[in-house]
Amino acid sequence: SIPWNLERITPPRYRADEYQPPDGGSLVEVYLLDTSIQSDHREIEGRVMVTDFENVPEEDGTRFHRQASKCDSHGTHLAGVVSGRRAGVAKGASMRSLRVLNCQGKGTVSGTLIGLEFIRKSQLVQPVGPLVVLLPLAGGYSRVLNAACQRLARAGVVLVTAAGNFRDDACLYSPASAPEVITVGATNAQDQPVTLGTLGTNFGRCVDLFAPGEDIIGASSDCSTCFVSQSGTSQAAAHVAGIAAMMLSAEPELTLAELRQRLIHFSAKDVINEAWFPEDQRVLTPNLVAALPPSTHGAGWQLFCRTVWSAHSGPTRMATAIARCAPDEELLSCSSFSRSGKRRGERMEAQGGKLVCRAHNAFGGEGVYAIARCCLLPQANCSVHTAPPAEASMGTRVHCHQQGHVLTGCSSHWEVEDLGTHKPPVLRPRGQPNQCVGHREASIHASCCHAPGLECKVKEHGIPAPQEQVTVACEEGWTLTGCSALPGTSHVLGAYAVDNTCVVRSRDVSTTGSTSEEAVTAVAICCRSRHLAQASQELQGSSDYKDDDKHHHHHHHH
Amino acid sequence: QEDEDGDYEELVLALRSEEDGLAEAPEHGTTATFHRCAKDPWRLPGTYVVVLKEETHLSQSERTARRLQAQAARRGYLTKILHVFHGLLPGFLVKMSGDLLELALKLPHVDYIEEDSSVFAQ
């Protein structure tokens, strides 16, 4: 029978034993930085080249006995999960192993750095096809390790890492906290986050997605035909490294940004029981379980977006938080969120030649998050149009006036500590989809983009307050680019995108003291690219790469 | 990576102008910073990654490492250069006493120094 984890990552319309992509990752080389491995194990023989790289600390303790099978256990299992003949994800992928962890599974930041440098030098000396680097390890937050990962990622290497097994915020660990790295948490057969003794999988905004990581059958170093079950975020990361190898083998030209967006898009959505996570981390943690794409053809017709949450601003009055997109992504909208509701909105601004999303805390606030909607939009030309606070009672409005520019997102920012509950008349942008409307005391920012074939529409859902959550989703074939609330009154905690749904959160009913007349409206901007669809159809003859369900996106970290 | 996370400890050691005549003093107003793991049991004091500014060449990295060794020796400290980085980040890995950190942070081209720390299989 097929192991549960391989069944889980198989696309819904296939059975795992029938799902046999033609090359299984054969064009891709996966580097594994881990313990020593038993490379002649029947499950992986001929698939793993053990490099001569070794940089490990001495084992602790005077009575430590170096037992080969124990030394090889972790790495052998992971190599099997990535590319094993029987229980591997990418059965065609070839691997190279570097030893950076000793027989007790311990290494150093410096040893890992030297290992990453070794990979970069190997890549320069002998350029091959796409490279995936699997880092199934974690240490405390390290500026230098994150910097090295950033450099390697910018050299075109895909890095996949374990979120960590500390039942903690992954942002406190490295390389999990490096924005350029694909960070993977672990779930079990019941789609629960994995518990490991008293601890468990890490979580939070630095996690990109989850993958199977409990009771994973793989090669055991106890004997050359043995299998063993292991658990952890390393096993989860190995699944994603395997999926990445398959995707890159099918589309070798994919950039890191494109690969990450595809991993998010093809993930199973909203299946993880979020109650396991600490309450304050639930909104920040992606509810995504990795899966293989339903076809090995490209998904180029899709407009891909994901949500990126900033770090928390902190509680000081003038504190701000910044969310950034990856270098080759476009910031299409910017929103903010505060658990206390005390915030002064958000704005898109240029920083180092690139737009960023900045959220502003308010006096007495416990802090804010900035939430960026980051999309893949080739040949895009985006700009921000701002309208200062209007004195008129009509409210502030701004629209995209340049020819061919469409509205992809609206933000509002105010200097006053409290917008008050007096709302402006909620004027709908009917017939004027390129217009943002906001409170008269707020400045309004419109994200206006021009890209081949880009079309957008506004979708709203308003319900009378008090209501803790209002949502509106984009329909099949459209992608959520913008998410905001109308009006921006003080009882609105903020707005953010989850997958293809715009969520507007309001203060708890009991604490708002709001009147039932106050309507809260979630405003979604939904876009699609006819250009991408046409280009893809020309490539494939027809678009056979449609997803059954809905379009899938979530967030990453900065 | 923004430093706003406060996820790790940052010790900024101020530059002292009276440091023995450096031919290439750091640019005015820039202060190299020292970082170490916030999780104490994972720290590995005595080994440090000295990260140099982005455009530093290998020859400059080697020169900076030698300079650190020479200045440390003048103060009676033994140091060992374990590795010189190039290809990803410019810099070097050095085994030395923590007493020398203030000196090391004043070397030309230094961006920051990070104390080595442990990583673990997950």
Partner: antibody
Framework: QVQLVQSGAEVKKPGASVKVSCKAS????????ISWVRQAPGQGLEWMGW????????NYAQKLQGRGTMTTDPSTSTAYMELRSLRSDDTAVYYC????????WGQGTTVTVSS | QSALTQPASVSGSPGQSITISCTGT?????????VSWYQQHPGKAPKLMIY???NRPSGVSNRFSGSKSGNTASLTISGLQAEDEADYYC?????????FGGGTKLTVL
């Protein structure tokens, strides 16, 4: 290129032992073990077992029943198969092959057991 | 470990296609995608022709193809040629060991 070169033919008396060698070259030794396969005259192929160049681990077919020992010497890139208490039905051509995948074979070593 | 079951002999004329079957159980052929096929000419060492059910090593003619359904694997040789006359053996993983088929003698008429 990948090559497995075996030792020469042997003639042994019943009850004796034989040790066949197989020298590997042209690939990373530790990435593959060595399988041993025999073929009695006019018969099919029979897998005897496997030995690791990496750590010396072995995996014997049940039929060997403790009569066989497989070893490796990584310093000389050589694998050995010793068969004890030879019987006449051990007369066969003994092959070494690379790994469990047996993608490359030695030329074979004829072992004749006759009184 | 019982040998896998192969027909003792098959034959075909030049240019024709033939198929050799290899039947095992769910513990070997059915349980693993690790079936190999070997060609052996008289007095020579076996040569790998197909590995992992359907993959051809470089240098092996594309006239040779492999497949599997349930507990039975098959080797098909199309466009038979005189030099294809040889013994053919299938091989599969089992949980802890390896097992060969009894062999099939292919005669090119």
């Amino acid at each position: 290129q990948v090559q497995l070169v075996q030792s020469g033919a042997e003639v042994k008396k019943p009850g004796a032992s034989v040790k066949v060698s197989c020298k590997a070259s042209g690939y990373t030794l530790t990435s593959y073990g060595i399988s041993w396969v025999r073929q009695a005259p006019g018969q099919g192929l029979e897998w005897m077992g496997w030995v690791s160049f990496y750590n010396g681990n072995t995996n014997y077919a049940q039929k060997l029943q403790g009569r066989g020992t497989m070893t490796t010497d990584p310093s000389t890139s050589t694998a050995y198969m010793e068969l004890r208490s030879l019987r006449s039905d051990d007369t066969a051509v003994y092959y070494c092959a690379r790994g469990y995948g047996m993608d490359v074979w030695g030329q074979g070593t004829t072992v004749t057991v006759s009184s | 470990q019982s040998a896998l079951t192969q027909p003792a002999s098959v034959s075909g004329s030049p240019g024709q296609s033939i198929t050799i079957s290899c039947t095992g159980t769910s513990s070997d052929v059915g349980g693993y995608n690790s079936v190999s096929w070997y060609q052996q000419h008289p007095g020579k060492a076996p040569k790998l022709m197909i590995y992992e059910v359907s993959n051809r090593p470089s240098g092996v003619s594309n006239r040779f193809s492999g497949s599997k359904s349930g507990n039975t694997a098959s080797l098909t040789i199309s466009g038979l040629q005189a030099e294809d006359e040889a013994d053919y053996y299938c091989n599969s993983y089992t949980s802890t060991s390896m097992v060969f088929g009894g062999g099939t003698k292919l005669t090119v008429l």
